[in-house]
């Protein structure tokens, strides 16, 4: 019994005069805007996006919207076309949804915010945006009260008219419409494809948060690792940073390239490499390989407990007003607009701490 290193877990609620607001990362579920896909993009990435077959032809499809098909047929006429250099990172950056077009309104603690308050970040969903990233010398925002008026409220247009037509199943095309959101500490990068939650158009979604500070014990009392980050890419250790680090190594090893959201200096994967290697290899790693990316728990971490609720937007009463305000049809408003409210439930944080049962 002397050699048993027991621990107990202490739970505490700590009142705070202010709390650091978390980073909020959001991604449109559509990776590339239809209007931004050029002839050259289509030539290089058309097969990856299931818009072309392997003979550079539009597949025989009965599912196509006539207007979109007409535009694509024109772009897919490659007679006498001379392909130009193509880079997936540049394609994601240029063709991804622009926060300046999506963001219809923004308020933090009642004060107006804007697209300038969102920092571009690349994830597996492509071009995404983080509010309150705490990077580029910007201070981390604080909140002094709980409740909806003391957090972030944004209204977004998800721009479904810009969604790529889906004529096949690929990792780069989505069956869904909406955004993915992750609420995370500024000390860890987003891992939104695995850890994000979905927010649908046609709804106002309320996310009530509670900050949780977790303190784990190292061996032999617990299993945490008081690691300093052994990484070329991230300053501080987190499970997320470790997993991104590991996924990057796995892809470079298997495919000799990296996806656009991965750090490092390996070349970006070409569309062909995405299709034949990077996408299936990463899917295999995430879904099947239980051993390659074993990331240890840090001894200190901050996470955010969340409770979600939703109401319909627009109401029948407001549909006409919103359509007029944003110069769109009522149908467009119903299919594209969402409101997201993120706030602290109360101004306290929870500590969950492992303590040695006896010294």
């Amino acid at each position: 019994y002397y050699f048993c290193y027991h621990h107990v877990t202490k739970l505490d609620e700590v009142a705070a005069s202010q709390l650091t607001f978390p980073a909020v990362t959001l991604c449109n579920l559509n990776e590339f805007r239809f209007s931004q896909v050029s002839k050259n993009d289509l030539y290089h990435a058309g097969e990856l996006l299931a818009l072309l077959n392997n003979r550079y032809e539009i597949p025989d499809t009965q599912m196509a919207d006539e207007k979109q098909l007409e535009i694509l047929q024109d772009k897919a006429n490659f007679r006498s076309f001379k392909p130009k250099p193509f880079n997936m990172r540049e394609f994601y950056d240029r063709a991804g949804h622009d926060i300046r077009d999506m963001l219809l309104s923004c308020h933090f603690r009642g004060e107006a915010c804007s697209a300038e308050d969102f920092k571009v970040v690349f994830t597996r969903y492509g071009k995404c945006y983080t509010f309150n990233s705490g990077q580029d010398g910007r201070p981390r925002l604080k909140t002094m009260k709980g409740g909806t008026g003391n957090g972030l409220e944004i209204m977004l247009d998800i721009q479904q008219d810009e969604y790529l037509p889906v004529w096949g199943e690929t990792d780069e095309t989505s069956f869904e419409a909406g955004i993915k959101v992750q609420i995370h500490s500024q000390d860890e990068p987003p891992f939104i494809d695995q850890l994000g939650f979905g927010v649908a158009p046609g709804f106002q979604t309320f996310v009530s948060c509670q900050e949780q500070r977790l303190i784990y014990l190292p061996s032999p009392w617990g299993t945490c690792n008081a690691v300093t980050m052994d990484s070329d890419f991230f300053d501080s250790y987190s499970i997320t940073a470790c997993r991104i680090d590991c996924e990057t190594r796995y892809l470079v090893e298997n495919c000799n390239c990296r996806m656009v959201h991965m750090p490092g200096d390996a070349p970006y994967c070409t569309p062909e490499q995405y299709k034949e290697c990077a996408d299936p290899a990463l899917d295999f790693l995430v879904e099947k390989d239980q051993e390659y990316c074993v990331c240890e728990m840090p001894c200190n971490l901050t996470r955010y407990g969340k409770e979600l609720s939703m109401v319909k937007i627009p109401s029948k009463a407001s549909a006409k007003y919103l359509a007029k305000k944003f110069n769109k049809s009522e149908q467009y408003i119903g299919e594209n607009i969402l409101v997201l409210d993120i706030f602290f439930e109360v101004l306290n944080y929870e500590t969950i701490e492992q303590k040695k049962a006896y010294e």
């Epitope: 199943e169 299936p280 290899a281 295999f284 099947k288 239980q290 051993e291 390659y292």
Partner: antibody
């Protein structure tokens, strides 16, 4: 270039033992699970056994459970299949394969014949 | 264990024909399915992985589709070199299993 080379096959009597080896090169061996697959003469392909990258996890087809043992030596980039209590129905070409998003390439195999 | 049922077992066809081989899994296997071609005395040769991705160097007349439990291998226009035995394999979960094979013969 990824390469796998099987060896150790041969003629053995029923009830006898044999140890197959697979030498791997061209990839970070310890990062990948490995499997053995066999094919009896004129028959189809049958998965036999698999082992995780660290060697900590092993899996077997029901037909060989309790008789075959898979192991690996990551320092030598080798995977092994120890076959005991061999039966006539174990006669086959044995291939080793790297488990990943695609199982490619395969070695040329090593032939095991169990006969008295 | 997941059973893989391949059909037909034997298929007679002529050069230029369009050929479809199907593979049905007894449980959902997502898209973790591969197709192999094998010729007598040779090791299996990978054609398609993750249900629909064409292995590098494999002619584009081969294509794969399906997800979940139903999968197909299509050869759009049969060539003399394509007469061989074809196997599907699920690598979604242990025990990894193969279909019983489809022997493609000259009619």
């Amino acid at each position: 270039e990824v390469q796998l080379l099987e060896s150790g096959g041969g003629l053995v009597q029923p009830g006898g033992s044999l140890r197959l080896s697979c030498a791997a090169s061209g990839f970070t061996f310890s990062s990948f699970a490995m499997s053995w697959v066999r094919q009896a003469p004129g028959k189809g392909l049958e998965w036999v056994s698999g082992i995780s990258g660290s060697g900590g996890g092993t899996h077997y087809a029901d037909s060989v459970k309790g008789r075959f043992t898979i192991s690996r030596d990551n320092s030598k980039n080798m995977v092994y299949l120890q076959m005991n209590s061999l039966r006539a129905e174990d006669t086959a070409a044995y291939y080793c394969a790297k488990e990943a998003y695609k199982w490619q390439p395969w070695g040329q195999g090593t032939l095991v014949t169990v006969s008295s | 264990d997941i059973q893989m049922t391949q059909s037909p077992s034997t298929l007679s066809a002529s050069v230029g024909d369009r050929v479809i081989i199907t593979c049905r899994a007894s449980q959902r296997i997502s898209s973790w399915l591969a197709w192999y071609q094998q010729k007598p005395g040779k090791a299996p040769n990978l054609l398609i992985y993750k249900a629909s991705i064409l292995e590098s160097g494999v002619p584009s007349r081969f294509s794969g589709s399906g997800s979940g439990t139903e999968f197909t291998l299509t050869i759009s226009s049969l060539q003399p070199d394509d007469f061989a035995t074809y196997y599907c394999q699920q690598y979604n979960s242990y025990s990894y299993t193969f279909g019983q094979g489809t022997k493609l013969e000259i009619k």
